[in-house]
Amino acid sequence: RKIPKVGHTFFQKPESCPPVPGGSMKLDIGIINENQRVSMSRNIESRSTSPWNYTVTWDPNRYPSEVVQAQCRNLGCINAQGKEDISMNSVPIQQETLVVRRKHQGCSVSFQLEKVLVTVGCTCVTPVIHHVQ
Amino acid sequence: GITIPRNPGCPNSEDKNFPRTVMVNLNIHNRNTNTNPKRSSDYYNRSTSPWNLHRNEDPERYPSVIWEAKCRHLGCINADGNVDYHMNSVPIQQEILVLRREPPHCPNSFRLEKILVSVGCTCVTPIVHHVA
């Protein structure tokens, strides 16, 4: 999957653009908005009717090296009595993010952008029943 | 990817940190081969905390289109299909990395940017912090 070139109608390539070898792009990995405020509700992973746990995956050849993945705790959803109701389903909600992968080839190193699918949390859904003809 | 020569003493000079600027291949490797979008595409409607999806488009960013979730209700949908205000629909937010064209409008020069997106909603029980 290639990054689309800028559209000619909207963009004019400025003179200030840095020279880049063919087939590659320059990437500054100093992150913009590194310390933004996240105002998510408290402890939603344990309070949800479809609760989840977090696992941290670590890879020194990936940037960022730490990626947090959620896993739904139950197949069903937690009802008002605190019991699992298997007539409903806990399902993962996923989001794509970009990472930079460092690859070693002998005494050389190369960098590749990767799309990674992150499970962010879980939601409780009503099951879909496909009626067979 | 684009190969960069290492230092002469390469076996002993393993750099634990990523350099500030790297040259990367224009092709993006997609690891997400085992997903079934048909199955998950209607979660936003079937959830007990359903959400709407809003298109956020920015040509200076890659990906240029990001879908933002917004919970439809304050409460959650109960077994009768009504909104139950004893429960709360809350957004699940996630910080993701995108590419920002830098300098602006340049075709092959980017900087990583962290953005906060709302991915979906989940139904939670109210939490009460008892004050001492």
Epitope: M40, S41, R42 | C121, I127, H129
Partner: nanobody, 128 residues
Amino acid sequence: EVQLVESGGGLVQAGGSLRLSCAASGFTFDDYDIGWFRQAPGKEREGVSCFTSSDGRTFYADSVKGRFTVSADNAKNTVYLQMNSLEPEDTAVYFCAAVNTFDESAYAAFACYDVVRWGQGTQVTVSS
């Protein structure tokens, strides 16, 4: 125990004013933000206004901007909703609620969400 009691509702003519009060007990405004919500007959509950005492930020639904104002008296642990230029469409039961989250990006159904406790509500009727 966290409790909220609304008062100040009533019948008023279009163009008139009312001031609703939300008396809180069992917590202080440092613990939670306060949201005002309303529910018209046969309709869903909707957000009206949010207030956070930590930095005095307020938020209003588009439908009430410029007409409603939220304020607080920390000494009395009470939040007020001043409603001016009332319209028949403002007729509803008004609720205040202690909420965990005030998020102006409004990814939830309203900018303040994750309700801890609802008040019992107070009826506001605006006649034409």
